[in-house]
């Protein structure tokens, strides 16, 4: 099923969203820190 319909599951999507959210938080934090240091 490597090329089938089951390659885009909700559980996989949720994990991707969690990673995106985490990265956005980390990058946002770094950006705020950079602005603060200026």
């Amino acid at each position: 099923h490597s090329d089938g319909i089951f390659t885009d599951s909700y559980s996989r999507y949720r994990k991707q969203m969690a990673v995106k959210k985490y990265l956005a938080a980390v990058l946002g934090k770094r950006y705020k820190q950079r602005v603060k240091n200026k």
Epitope: H1, D3, G4, I5, F6, T7, D8, S9, Y10, S11, Y13
Partner: antibody
């Protein structure tokens, strides 16, 4: 924001053709499994078919060669080409994301086949 | 063709009732790819449960799913006013096809 917006529905004569569009935002259609699902007035949901990341398409037996699913990666848009339309194709057509389970849905677009 | 049989087709219930809807498939679903949806008139379906028993994000805990193979159940432990709607099951199959149940309308008794 993750969103799907269908367009292209309307009134079409029996035997005619129509192409529906589904514009995605918040994710890329080329890496997702995208589907078309329809619902005739007062009836249940019916899966039409799917397109997977590789571009391979899968269809319900009821689609019987009259319906074609495609996508334009540059426009992040999914399409449903419908040919030789019949009165029984009158329905709200939804696009939805997910493989075997539909976790993001558009608002739907109504297609009416009538003379 | 694969048949997804949902029962009952209509269910009359009161607020606070425990409600159970069943979905039977003529063929075993692939890797428990059985999902449930709620639909209100004029609206798109809402994703409730995935892989038979997992609650989608934001779905109240009064909803639960169970089952495997060919027999599945959706339960609402205590029916709320917002829950009066039509519910559909959908199964994913190894042939890369999807089938929907006929729907169950939950109406006010």
């Amino acid at each position: 924001e993750v969103q799907l917006v269908e367009s292209g529905g309307g009134l079409v004569q029996p035997g005619g053709s129509l192409r529906l569009s589904c514009a995605a935002s918040g994710f890329t259609v080329s890496s997702a499994v995208m589907n078309w699902v329809r619902q005739a007035p007062g009836k249940g949901l019916e899966w039409i078919g799917s397109i997977v990341a590789s571009g391979t398409t899968y269809y319900a037996s009821s689609a019987n060669g009259r319906f074609t699913i495609s996508r334009d990666n540059s426009k992040n848009t999914l399409y449903l080409q419908m040919n030789s339309l019949r009165a029984e194709d009158t329905a709200v057509y939804y696009c939805a994301r997910g493989g075997g389970e539909f976790f993001i849905w558009g608002q739907g677009t109504l297609v009416t086949v009538s003379s | 063709d694969i048949q997804m049989t949902q029962s009952p087709s209509t269910l009359s219930a009161s607020v606070g009732d425990r409600v159970t809807i069943t979905c039977q498939s003529s063929e075993s679903v692939y890797s428990n790819y059985l999902s449930w949806y709620q639909q209100k008139p004029g609206k798109a379906p809402k994703f409730l449960i995935y892989q038979a028993s997992n609650l989608a994000s934001g779905v109240p805990s009064r909803f639960s799913g169970s089952g495997s193979g060919t027999e599945f159940t959706l339960t609402i432990s205590s029916l709320q006013p917002d829950d009066f709607a039509t519910y559909y099951c959908a199964g994913g199959y190894s042939e890369n096809i999807v089938g929907f149940g006929g729907g169950t309308k939950v109406e006010i008794k």
